[in-house]
C-alpha cells in the first residue's frame, strides 16, 4: 500500500506547487488570478503594511496545531483593524477616577462597516501594547454590559518586562453580541485582578494610549499603536457564495 | 496516487483490525497480551469499574480534536485517582472561618504513591461535584503557595441548573510542583470572584464533601464523591523503555 | 566559467542531460519531456495523444467513478463531452469552452479533433470525435446512439425519451 | 516529531517534511500577491510501512508503530500535522486587501 | 464535515469515515481486556482527487478543493482528522489497571 | 501572443495635435493598466502617462500635464494618447506598453511611432 | 521627482566578461526597480522586475540586486546579443522615472 518505487522528488514539487495555485485562488473564490489593471503604481499603503504585520505576528505567536476546519474556515479571511475610540471622547468622562482600571471603546458604526453581518466574523481579538512593567501584575478583562455593569470576560498574568509587549485577547463573541446589537458605542475595561482578601488593588501596567499618569486622563496616542480590534471575518460577497454552495454537502 | 478500482473493504477492514491488534499491545508496550493467570474470579472492583466510569466520563466530554502527539503521549496512560483529605483533618482548622472560599487538601505522599517521579505525570485533573445552584456564579481557583499565600490558577463561570455536576479543572502544572516539593500536605482553594468594587463575595455553589452550612465544618462525605485528582501517568516501568528508546529519533 | 554540469551530476536528472552554457546550464529532456521554464529541470509533456480516463462532470461527490471512457486523448475527451481527464482520479479539468486554452486544445471547436497524421496542404486535417464509438454505452444507455458532425444522437424505444443529464433514456411517466 | 527541525537536518528516508519554498513569482507567475513575495509551505513525503502484527509480537516490531502507524491504519499515509495561515496581501481593484489563508504552512508531518 | 453523522448517513463513495466496530473477543480472540468488550474504531476510506489546477480555472472545480484537497497535498490521502481516546481496564497479574489510550476511535475523516 | 501595435505618428506643426492609438491583441485588454513611454532620437527614455485597466484612474509625467490626455476604449482594445499644443522638445518615437502587474513593470512593448513637431 | 543615476554611461567589454551596471536613486524605493534592454531601432525589453526578479524567458546570465537606494545588473557572462543599452526604472512613486541609460560596447 506503501510504494517503494524511488520517489521522482521534483516530480513531488511540481504538483505540490500547482496543488497549491488552486488552492489559494480556492480559499480566496477566485476563478482565476485578479485582475491587476487597477492597482496604482508605489508601494503598499502604511496602514495596510502596518495591518499585515499585525497579522503576520499574530501568526508567528500562535501555536502550530491543526484544527478540524469547517467548511468556512477554509475559506480566506479579511483582516481589518478598528482603533478605540480616543481618550479624549467624552464617552470616557464618567470613568476617569479608577486607580485599578482603564476603559476602551469602540465605535460600533467602524467594527459594522469592517463586518456588515455578527455571522461573518470569524476572529475578534483586542490588541494593547503594554509598556514595560515593574511587577507581576495579575489583570482581567471585563465587557460593558448594562447600564453600569461589567461582565467578566477573561484574565493574564503579566510577567514583568523591560520591553514593550502586545498583549492579545480573544473577544470574538462579544464583538459578535455588539454587532447584533444597536448601540453606538462598547466598552471593555481592564482591571487589575481584586483578590477577596487583597487591599493593593492598583493596576500598575502601562497600555500605550493612556498617560502614564492617572489612567484615563487624556492620553497621547503614540501614533496607530493604541488599543485596537484586530477582526477576521468572510468578505460579505464571499458569504453569499458560500451560502448559495451549501448544497454540495 | 488514488485508485479507482474497486476496493476490497473486507480486506481493508482485516488489516485496520490487526493494525489495531499491534496498535493496542505497543501503546501499552506489551510484547504479547498479558497473562490472565493470576486474576482472581468475579467482577472488577467497585473503585476500579467507578475510575474506568470516571474516565469514560471524561473522554465524552472532551472534544475531539487530533492533537499533535509527542512520542510519550501515544503510549497508554495509567489512570488512579486521590481522594482529599477528609474535612476533619487538622489542617482545615485554620481556614474555617471564611464564607467566600471552600479549601482542599491532599496528602503528597499518596500521590507520589500513584505518581513516582514528576515527570511520568501527563495530565492531573482537580475533580468536583457541584451540587444544585440557584444563581450564576463565578468562582476562582487558587493552589497553596507559600505560608498563608495563594497563587490564582483559573476561574468558571457556573450556570444555575437543578442537577448536580462533574467540574474539572486542569492542575498539571500544579501537581508536577508538588510531587516535586518536599510537602506533606498540599492544598486548592475554590472561591467566589471578587470583583474590586463588588461587596457580596459569598461562595453560593455547594460542592459535595463539605456540609452546606458553613462551608469547613465537619462534612459529611457522600461516598467516594468527595473532591478528589484524576491522575494521568505513564507507568514507572514503561517509563524506563521509554528513555531506553530515546536513541531512535 | 563554472561547469554546473560536472559539479553536480544530478542536475537535469532522471529524465534529461544536463549541457553547460557559460555562466549558466540547460537541460537537454528526453523524448516525453520539456524542459522546465527555467530551463534548469525536466517534466512530463502531457502528449495530446497520451490515452487516458475521461470524467463527465465535477458536479457529482463521486466523479471520479463518472467515468466515460477509459482509454482517450485529451482532445477526444475535453473536445467533446468531458470535463475532465487524467487517471487513477488524478484529474486534469477541461479548460473552459471559449477561453484560450480550450482554442488551444481544440483549434477546431467543439466535436473535432486535429489528425496529425492527415496533413492538407501543411495544416492538419480536423476529424469529427465519434462519441457514440468512445462513449457509446455510457452517453446512451438503453438508446441507440447515431454519430452526427459534430455531435451525436440517442434514439430511444417508444414510450422513452432521452434524458441529457442522466445521459440515458428514460421511461415517460404517463 | 516529524518537524523542521528533525527532518530539515536529517537523511531520513520514512516520512518527514519536506522543505518547499514558492515564490509567487517564479514557481506561480503570479504577480498579483504583494506580500508576501513567498513563503515555506513545505510538503510532507516519505513512506509509512505496514506492519502486519502477529499476537507473538516482539518489541522491536512494536516499537515501529509509534512512527509508522501510530493510527492502526490499513492503509497508513505521511500526512501533515501541525499546519500555521499565511497572511497576504493583493489588490481588489484600486483596494488593498490583508487576507488570511488557513493552514497554508506544513511545519510538521506523521504517519496516520 | 466528514463524520461519522454525515458518513454514516450517506452513501460517500470518496473520502468518509466508515463503520467499524471491534469486539475485543470475537475480533482479536482477547480475553484479557475486562472493560470495554470493544469499541467503535472506525476508519478512513476513500479516494481524494488530485486536481491538475489551470489557472483558467472556473468556480466548479475550484469548489473541489475544500473537501478534496484543502492541504494541496502533491497526493492527497484520507486521514483521521478527530479523535477520542479509550480506556480499558485490564489485569496485570492480581492487579487491574485502569489505562486510557490516546488517539483510538475516529470520529471524522478528511483529505490531507 | 501579444502584440501592441501603435499609429498616428508623423510630422506636425508646434501648438497643433495628434492622436496616437494602439491597437492590442492576444491578452485580455481591460484586465492591464496600459502607458506610453517616448524616447527623444538619441536620448534615453521618458515615461509620459498611464491609465489604469478601467479606464477610471490616469498619471502624468509633469512636462505633459495639462497638454496630453490618455484613454482607452476596451470593446476596441485600444488605447490613445491626444497630444495638444505639442512643442518641438516633444519630438520622440512614441511606444506604447502594457503594465503587466501591481509592480508596474512594462513586459510588453509596441514597435514604436515617430512624431516630429517641426515648423 | 525621484532622480536615477545610472554608472557608467557606457562601458566596453568581451564576450564571456562578467559586467555589472549600477543605479542609485535620489530616495529609497524599496524594491520598486526594473531594468530594461534596448537595442538600436528596437523597442526596449523588460529583463528584471522588483529589483531582483527575471522576467519569463530572459536568460539567466541576467540578474538582479539591491534594495532601498542603491541597485545592481548583472551579466554573468557576456554573449554577442548582449551588446545594447541598458536603463533602470523606478515605480515606487508618479512621476515613474527612467535612469538615463548604460550602453555596454564591443571591446
Known amino acids: 500500500l506503501s510504494t517503494c518505487k524511488t520517489i521522482d522528488m521534483e516530480l513531488v514539487k511540481r504538483k505540490r506547487i500547482e496543488a497549491i495555485r488552486g488552492q489559494i485562488l480556492s480559499k480566496l473564490r477566485l476563478a482565476s488570478p485578479p485582475s491587476q489593471g487597477e492597482v496604482p503604481p508605489g508601494p503598499l499603503p502604511e496602514a495596510v503594511l502596518a495591518l499585515y504585520n499585525s497579522t503576520r505576528d499574530r501568526v508567528a505567536g500562535e501555536s502550530a496545531e491543526p484544527e478540524p476546519e469547517p467548511e468556512a474556515d477554509y475559506y480566506a479571511k479579511e483582516v481589518t483593524r478598528v482603533l478605540m475610540v480616543e481618550t479624549h471622547n467624552e464617552i470616557y468622562d464618567k470613568f476617569k477616577q479608577s486607580t485599578h482600571s482603564i476603559y476602551m471603546f469602540f465605535n460600533t458604526s467602524e467594527l459594522r462597516e469592517a463586518v456588515p453581518e455578527p455571522v461573518l466574523l470569524s476572529r475578534a481579538e483586542l490588541r494593547l501594547l503594554r509598556l514595560k512593567l515593574k511587577v507581576e501584575q495579575h489583570v482581567e478583562l471585563y465587557q460593558k454590559y448594562s447600564n453600569n455593569s461589567w461582565r467578566y470576560l477573561s484574565n493574564r498574568l503579566l510577567a514583568p518586562s523591560d520591553s514593550p509587549e502586545w498583549l492579545s485577547f480573544d473577544v470574538t463573541g462579544v464583538v459578535r453580541q455588539w454587532l447584533s446589537r444597536g448601540g453606538e458605542i462598547e466598552g471593555f475595561r481592564l482591571s487589575a485582578h481584586c483578590s477577596c482578601d487583597s487591599r493593593d488593588n492598583t493596576l500598575q501596567v502601562d497600555i500605550n494610549g493612556f498617560t502614564t499618569g492617572r489612567r484615563g486622563d487624556l492620553a497621547t496616542i503614540h501614533g496607530m499603536n493604541r488599543p485596537f480590534l484586530l477582526l477576521m471575518a468572510t468578505p460579505l460577497e464571499r458569504a453569499q457564495h458560500l451560502q448559495s454552495s451549501r448544497h454540495r454537502r | 496516487l488514488s485508485t479507482c478500482k474497486t476496493i476490497d473493504m473486507e480486506l481493508v477492514k482485516r488489516k485496520r483490525i490487526e493494525a489495531i491488534r499491534g496498535q493496542i499491545l505497543s501503546k501499552l508496550r506489551l510484547a504479547s497480551p498479558p497473562s490472565q493467570g493470576e486474576v482472581p474470579p468475579g467482577p472488577l472492583p467497585e473503585a476500579v469499574l467507578a475510575l474506568y466510569n470516571s474516565t469514560r466520563d471524561r473522554v465524552a466530554g472532551e472534544s475531539a480534536e487530533p492533537e499533535p502527539e509527542p512520542e510519550a503521549d501515544y503510549y497508554a496512560k495509567e489512570v488512579t485517582r486521590v481522594l482529599m483529605v477528609e474535612t476533619h483533618n487538622e489542617i482545615y482548622d485554620k481556614f474555617k472561618q471564611s464564607t467566600h472560599s471552600i479549601y482542599m487538601f491532599f496528602n503528597t505522599s499518596e500521590l507520589r504513591e500513584a505518581v513516582p517521579e514528576p515527570v511520568l505525570l501527563s495530565r492531573a485533573e482537580l475533580r468536583l461535584l457541584r451540587l444544585k445552584l440557584k444563581v450564576e456564579q463565578h468562582v476562582e481557583l487558587y493552589q497553596k503557595y507559600s505560608n498563608n499565600s495563594w497563587r490564582y490558577l483559573s476561574n468558571r463561570l457556573l450556570a444555575p441548573s437543578d442537577s448536580p455536576e462533574w467540574l474539572s479543572f486542569d492542575v498539571t502544572g500544579v501537581v508536577r510542583q508538588w510531587l516535586s516539593r518536599g510537602g506533606e500536605i498540599e492544598g486548592f482553594r475554590l472561591s467566589a470572584h471578587c470583583s474590586c468594587d463588588s461587596r457580596d463575595n459569598t461562595l453560593q455553589v455547594d460542592i459535595n464533601g463539605f456540609t452546606t452550612g458553613r462551608r469547613g465544618d465537619l462534612a459529611t462525605i457522600h461516598g467516594m464523591n468527595r473532591p478528589f485528582l484524576l491522575l494521568m501517568a505513564t507507568p514507572l516501568e514503561r517509563a524506563q523503555h521509554l528513555q531506553s528508546s530515546r536513541h531512535r529519533r | 566559467d563554472i561547469d554546473e554540469c560536472s559539479q553536480d551530476p544530478s542536475l537535469c536528472l532522471p529524465h534529461g542531460a544536463c549541457k553547460n552554457l557559460q555562466g549558466s546550464y540547460v537541460c537537454v529532456c528526453d523524448e516525453g519531456f520539456t524542459p522546465t521554464q527555467d530551463q534548469h529541470g525536466c517534466e512530463e509533456v502531457e502528449q495530446p495523444h497520451h490515452k487516458k480516463e475521461c470524467y463527465l462532470n465535477f458536479d457529482d461527490t463521486v466523479f471520479c467513478d463518472s467515468v466515460l471512457a477509459t482509454n482517450v486523448t485529451q482532445q477526444e475527451c475535453c473536445c467533446s463531452l468531458g470535463a475532465g481527464w487524467g487517471d487513477h482520479c488524478e484529474i486534469y479539468p477541461c479548460p473552459v469552452y471559449s477561453s484560450a486554452e480550450f482554442h488551444s486544445l481544440c483549434p477546431d471547436g467543439k466535436g473535432y479533433t486535429q489528425d496529425n497524421n492527415i496533413v492538407n496542404y501543411g495544416i492538419p486535417a480536423h476529424r469529427d470525435i465519434d462519441e457514440c464509438m468512445l462513449f457509446g454505452s455510457e452517453i446512451c444507455k438503453e438508446g441507440k446512439c447515431v454519430n452526427t458532425q459534430p455531435g451525436y444522437e440517442c434514439y430511444c424505444k417508444q414510450g422513452f425519451y432521452y434524458d441529457g443529464n442522466l445521459l440515458e433514456c428514460v421511461d415517460v411517466d404517463e | 516529531a516529524l518537524d523542521t527541525n528533525y527532518c530539515f537536518s536529517s537523511t531520513e528516508k520514512n516520512c518527514c517534511v519536506r522543505q518547499l519554498y514558492i515564490d509567487f513569482r517564479k514557481d506561480l507567475g503570479w504577480k498579483w500577491i504583494h506580500e508576501p513575495k513567498g513563503y515555506h509551505a513545505n510538503f510532507c513525503l516519505g513512506p509509512c510501512p505496514y506492519i502486519w502484527s502477529l499476537d507473538t509480537q516482539y518489541s522491536k516490531v512494536l516499537a515501529l508503530y509509534n512512527q509508522h502507524n501510530p493510527g492502526a491504519s490499513a492503509a497508513p499515509c505521511c500526512v501533515p500535522q501541525a499546519l500555521e495561515p499565511l497572511p497576504i496581501v493583493y489588490y481588489v481593484g484600486r483596494k488593498p486587501k490583508v487576507e488570511q489563508l488557513s493552514n497554508m504552512i506544513v511545519r510538521s508531518c506523521k504517519c496516520s | 464535515a466528514l463524520d461519522t453523522n454525515y458518513c454514516f448517513s450517506s452513501t460517500e463513495k470518496n473520502c468518509c469515515v466508515r463503520q467499524l466496530y471491534i469486539d475485543f473477543r470475537k475480533d482479536l480472540g482477547w480475553k484479557w481486556i475486562h472493560e470495554p468488550k470493544g469499541y467503535h474504531a472506525n476508519f478512513c476510506l476513500g479516494p481524494c482527487p488530485y486536481i491538475w489546477s489551470l489557472d483558467t480555472q472556473y468556480s466548479k472545480v475550484l469548489a473541489l478543493y475544500n473537501q478534496h484537497n484543502p492541504g494541496a497535498s502533491a497526493a492527497p490521502c484520507c486521514v483521521p482528522q478527530a479523535l477520542e481516546p479509550l480506556p480499558i481496564v485490564y489485569y496485570v497479574g492480581r492487579k487491574p489497571k485502569v489505562e486510557q489510550l490516546s488517539n483510538m476511535i475516529v470520529r471524522s475523516c478528511k483529505c490531507s | 501572443q501579444v502584440q501592441l501595435v501603435e499609429s498616428g505618428g508623423g510630422v506636425v506643426q508646434p501648438g497643433r495635435s495628434l492622436r496616437l492609438s494602439c491597437a492590442a491583441s492576444?491578452?485580455?485588454?481591460?484586465?492591464?493598466?496600459m502607458t506610453w513611454v517616448r524616447q527623444a532620437p538619441g536620448k534615453g527614455l521618458e515615461w509620459v502617462s498611464a491609465i489604469s485597466g478601467s479606464g477610471a484612474a490616469t498619471y502624468f509625467a509633469d512636462s505633459v500635464k495639462g497638454r496630453f490626455t490618455i484613454s482607452r476604449d476596451n470593446s476596441k482594445n485600444t488605447l490613445y494618447l491626444q497630444m495638444n499644443s505639442l512643442r518641438a522638445e516633444d519630438t520622440a518615437v512614441y511606444y506604447c506598453?502594457?503594465?503587466?502587474?501591481?509592480?508596474?513593470?512594462?513586459?510588453?512593448w509596441g514597435q514604436g511611432t515617430l512624431v516630429t513637431v517641426s515648423s | 521627482d525621484i532622480q536615477l543615476t545610472q554608472s557608467p554611461s557606457s562601458l566596453s567589454a568581451s564576450v564571456g566578461d562578467r559586467v555589472t551596471i549600477t543605479c542609485r536613486a535620489s530616495q529609497s524605493i524599496s524594491s520598486y526597480l526594473n531594468w530594461y534592454q534596448q537595442k538600436p531601432g528596437k523597442a526596449p525589453k523588460l529583463l528584471i522586475y522588483?529589483?531582483?526578479n527575471l522576467q519569463s524567458g530572459v536568460p539567466s546570465r541576467f540578474s538582479g540586486s539591491g534594495s532601498g537606494t542603491d541597485f545592481t545588473l548583472t551579466i554573468s557572462s557576456l554573449q554577442p546579443e548582449d551588446f545594447a543599452t541598458y536603463y533602470c526604472q523606478q515605480t515606487y512613486t508618479v512621476p515613474l522615472t527612467f535612469g538615463g541609460g548604460t550602453k555596454v560596447e564591443i571591446k
Open positions: 492576444g491578452f485580455t485588454f481591460s484586465s492591464f493598466a
Open positions: 522588483a529589483a531582483s
Open positions: 506598453a502594457r503594465v503587466s502587474s501591481g509592480h508596474w513593470d512594462f513586459d510588453e
